[in-house]
């Protein structure tokens, strides 16, 4: 399976909400012996590999933000944990996998990684990740709402605030 990032760069004004999204796709075995563990974390652009470093998002670690379930089931993180930190990660039936960050501040700027791990009985794990940049801006140069720049060469498109 693979993970695709719909957008490689999100530029948002301070105070706005944003939803960062990954999509995982490929042959999905819906049998009992496969589980998908999905999570988010902050990282840095390493010299060798992007997303190797795992830093917390607003003090929540990748373990705090994880989802795990079989096949393409939907899932959400703990709501009270999410509300306390203005965060929520979620997954739908179509392979979309997102984290919503509310009331953005300049400190939220940085590289974000989504991680999907396939857990299978008697098999080594299969890990894939996606990376995207979040820029939170303030002042007259800041956009009025979040703008997402596609990972491919398509035109950028505005995204609705979460």
């Amino acid at each position: 399976f693979k993970v695709a990032t719909l957008y490689s760069l999100y530029v948002c004004p301070e105070g706005q909400n944003v939803t960062l999204t990954c999509r995982f796709f490929g042959p999905v075995d819906k049998g009992h012996d496969v589980t998908f563990y999905k999570t988010w974390y902050r990282s840095s652009r390493g010299e060798v590999q992007t997303c190797s470093e795992r830093r917390p998002i607003r003090n929540l670690t990748f373990q705090d933000l994880h989802l795990h379930h079989g096949g393409h089931q939907a899932a959400n993180t703990s709501h009270d944990l999410a509300q306390r930190h203005g965060l929520e990660s979620a997954s739908d039936h179509h392979g979309n996998f997102s984290i919503t960050m509310r009331n953005l501040t300049l400190l939220d700027s940085g590289l974000y990684c989504c991680l999907v791990v396939e857990i299978r009985h008697h098999h080594s794990e299969h890990r894939v990740h996606g990376a995207m940049e979040l820029q939170v801006q303030t002042g007259k140069d800041a956009p009025s709402s979040c703008v997402a720049y596609p990972s491919s060469s398509q035109e950028s498109e505005n995204i609705t605030a979460a």
């Epitope: 060798v48 190797s52 795992r54």
Partner: antibody, heavy 118, light 107 residues
Framework: QVQLQQSGAELMKPGASVKISCKAT????????IEWVKQRPGHGLEWIGE????????NFNEKFKGKATFTADTSSNTAYLQLSSLTSDDSAVYYC???????????WGAGTTVTVSS | DIVMTQSHKFMSTSVGDRVSITCKAS??????VAWYQQKPGQSPKLLIY???YRYTGVPDRFTGSGSGTDFTFTISSVQAEDLTVYYC?????????FGGGTKLEIK
């Protein structure tokens, strides 16, 4: 905080079986692997295998197939390692450790000493 | 299985010295290597993950580097409490394997 509490030391006779426990607290037990690692006196670390409590998925070091059995009880957040047909080679400290999927052994139990002697 | 080789079982050093421990993988493991410290009578503790990143709360005198097959763990200024055993481990593919360990001793 995240902790793994292991059961106490065991003195066993050759040929017997022993079951070691590892109780997890401070995190969602079902969504991280529990690893089992053997360390004989004066020796290095040897991976035995792992269990993912959320699904029951298992992975073994081939060397320990037939020797080690892993189970996990999600109602009590406890993982178990059973060692069968004990010999003096099984005398060692056995550690459990947590491993979030796609990551490393980040939290370890204090270890359980198993001594096999007639 | 991937074999992790720590070529020195023992290394002599002095308090305040800089010391480096090496680990070689039998095949490419990208940066999927961790370093653990184990003091006598204690369980191992994670110090470095993904070859070069310090785990939470680990002092900055501990650093790691490398990728592919060759990895290095460095203590920039050895403290008395650092004189113990260090293990590398690969997390590239199961079965997870450890190096044989390197014991830091006083010169």
């Amino acid at each position: 905080q995240v902790q793994l509490q292991q059961s106490g030391a065991e003195l066993m006779k050759p040929g017997a079986s022993v079951k070691i426990s590892c109780k997890a607290t401070g995190y969602t037990f079902s969504s991280s692997w529990i690893e089992w690692v053997k360390q004989r006196p004066g020796h290095g670390l040897e991976w035995i295998g792992e269990i993912f409590p959320g699904s029951g998925s298992l992975n073994f070091n081939e060397k320990f197939k037939g020797k080690a059995t892993f189970t996990a009880d999600t109602s009590s957040n406890t993982a178990y390692l059973q060692l069968s047909s004990l010999t003096s080679d099984d005398s060692a400290v056995y550690y459990c450790a947590r491993r979030p999927p796609g990551w490393f052994f980040d939290v370890w139990g204090a270890g359980t000493t198993v001594t096999v002697s007639s | 299985d991937i074999v992790m080789t720590q070529s020195h079982k023992f290394m002599s050093t002095s308090v305040g010295d800089r010391v480096s421990i090496t680990c070689k993988a039998s095949q490419d493991v990208t940066t999927d290597v961790a370093w653990y410290q184990q003091k006598p009578g204690q369980s191992p503790k994670l110090l470095i993950y993904s070859a070069s990143y310090r785990y939470t709360g680990v002092p900055d005198r501990f650093t790691g580097s490398g990728s592919g097959t060759d990895f290095t763990f460095t203590i920039s200024s050895v403290q008395a409490e650092d004189l113990t055993v260090y293990y590398c481990q690969q997390h590239y593919s199961s079965p997870w394997t450890f190096g044989g360990g390197t014991k830091l001793e006083i010169k």
